[in-house]
């Protein structure tokens, strides 16, 4: 079999959910010394970057201007060192948001509940869509899906303090084209009286891997980066759908 280099890691900078007409940035983290990176979209070559100087940087950024529903879909990247190509990266699903309309999110029995209560979110959108998505802030990869004609329900079951946080919903016109986000609904879950004050609220930082960690090589970095790259490839998965 043909020898190949380890597959690169593809990431969306800041988020994989990009409002229409805004710029998306995808990063492809490959290897120091890579002379060419190719970004592929739905099986087609979409963009090429050639880092300068190649031996000093371990990846590239691809800027996708003016995001729209035609540019939303599955991206992957690949890189070359000398004559040797890498394996293809995992697929990254890029979603366009702020399409058409804005859904309304509500929660039953209400936004303030006690631990153990059953909670259901309702997402309503009157325009033609049948798939609805519920996301928790800071957990944008954990998308819950539900189906309905104009409204979908998201039963959460008995909640715990881990369910605390801000939620938004979207209507989805297809897997990669979503509506505007709803206004957020903040769910407050109070636990047992003695540990309520200690229960931490959920962090609302973006997902830590939604950051482009491209580095310029300095001394020891090359060996560390190679080790880190291999480790990340081993543990990293980017299928959100």
């Amino acid at each position: 079999p043909k020898q190949t280099l380890p597959k690169p890691i593809i990431r969306a900078e800041s988020t994989y959910m990009v409002p229409k007409e805004k710029q998306a940035t995808l990063c492809c983290q490959g290897s120091y010394g890579a002379v060419e990176y190719q970004l592929h979209f739905e099986g087609s070559l979409f963009a090429v970057e050639r880092p300068k100087p190649p031996e000093r940087i371990n990846g590239v950024k691809f800027h996708i201007p003016d995001m729209n529903s035609r540019k939303a879909g599955r991206y992957s990247c690949i890189y070359r060192v000398g004559e040797l190509w890498s394996e293809r990266s995992d697929l990254l699903d890029l979603v366009v948001t702020e399409m058409y309309d804005t859904p309304t999110l509500s929660v039953h029995p209400g936004p303030e509940v006690t631990s153990g209560e059953k909670v259901t979110f309702y997402c309503r959108l009157d325009t033609a869509t049948s798939m609805f998505l519920l996301l928790k802030e800071g957990r944008s990869r954990d998308v819950q899906r539900s189906y309905g004609k104009v409204q979908a329900e998201f039963p959460m079951g008995p909640v715990t303090t881990a369910h605390r946080g801000s939620y938004r919903c979207f209507g989805s016109y297809n897997n990669y084209a979503w509506s505007f986000p709803s206004e957020p609904v903040k769910l407050l879950v109070t636990g047992d009286i003695e540990n309520t004050s200690l229960a931490p609220t959920d962090p609302t930082f973006p997902d830590s891997w939604d950051t482009c960690l491209l580095t310029r090589e300095t001394g020891l970095q090359k060996d560390l980066a190679l080790w880190d790259h291999t480790a990340q490839n081993h543990h990293h998965h980017h299928h959100h759908h």
């Epitope: 979209f41 087609s44 979409f46 090429v48 540019k71 690949i78």
Partner: nanobody, 120 residues
Framework: DVQLVESGGGLVQPGGSLRLSCAIS????????MSWVRQAPGKGPERVSW????????SYADSVKGRFTISRDNARNMLYLQMNSLKSEDTARYYC?????????????WGQGTQVTVSS
């Protein structure tokens, strides 16, 4: 910089032949699938033919099957389209492109195109 430069178009009589060429630079051509896409005046783009990186797979639009042949020379970074038994309905601007599924000139890499006119 990535460049795709088509040539070989022109005016030809019905039943005649043309060979279109596309010279490619700026990326490693040999691993990239390529398409020929045409656009007739007032019509949307239509993929005429597609070829994968090592030429092991090709496909054609029904309208050109048996008349057109796509090929490539990876050593020379060239893509070709041999067009035989040309018909008036083949009149269009022909583009070579890296796009295989979205035939939109704002997408991926496209050449400037070469005009083919079939007329008696």
């Amino acid at each position: 910089d990535v460049q795709l430069v088509e040539s070989g178009g022109g005016l030809v009589q019905p039943g005649g032949s043309l060979r279109l060429s596309c010279a490619i630079s700026g990326f490693t051509f040999s691993i990239v699938s390529m398409s020929w896409v045409r656009q007739a005046p007032g019509k949307g783009p239509e993929r005429v033919s597609w070829i994968n990186g090592d030429s092991s797979n090709t496909s054609y639009a029904d309208s050109v099957k048996g008349r057109f042949t796509i090929s490539r020379d990876n050593a020379r970074n060239m893509l070709y389209l041999q067009m035989n038994s040309l018909k008036s309905e083949d009149t269009a601007r022909y583009y070579c492109t890296t796009q295989n599924s979205h035939y939109d000139i704002r997408f991926g890499y496209w050449g400037q195109g070469t005009q083919v006119t079939v007329s008696s």
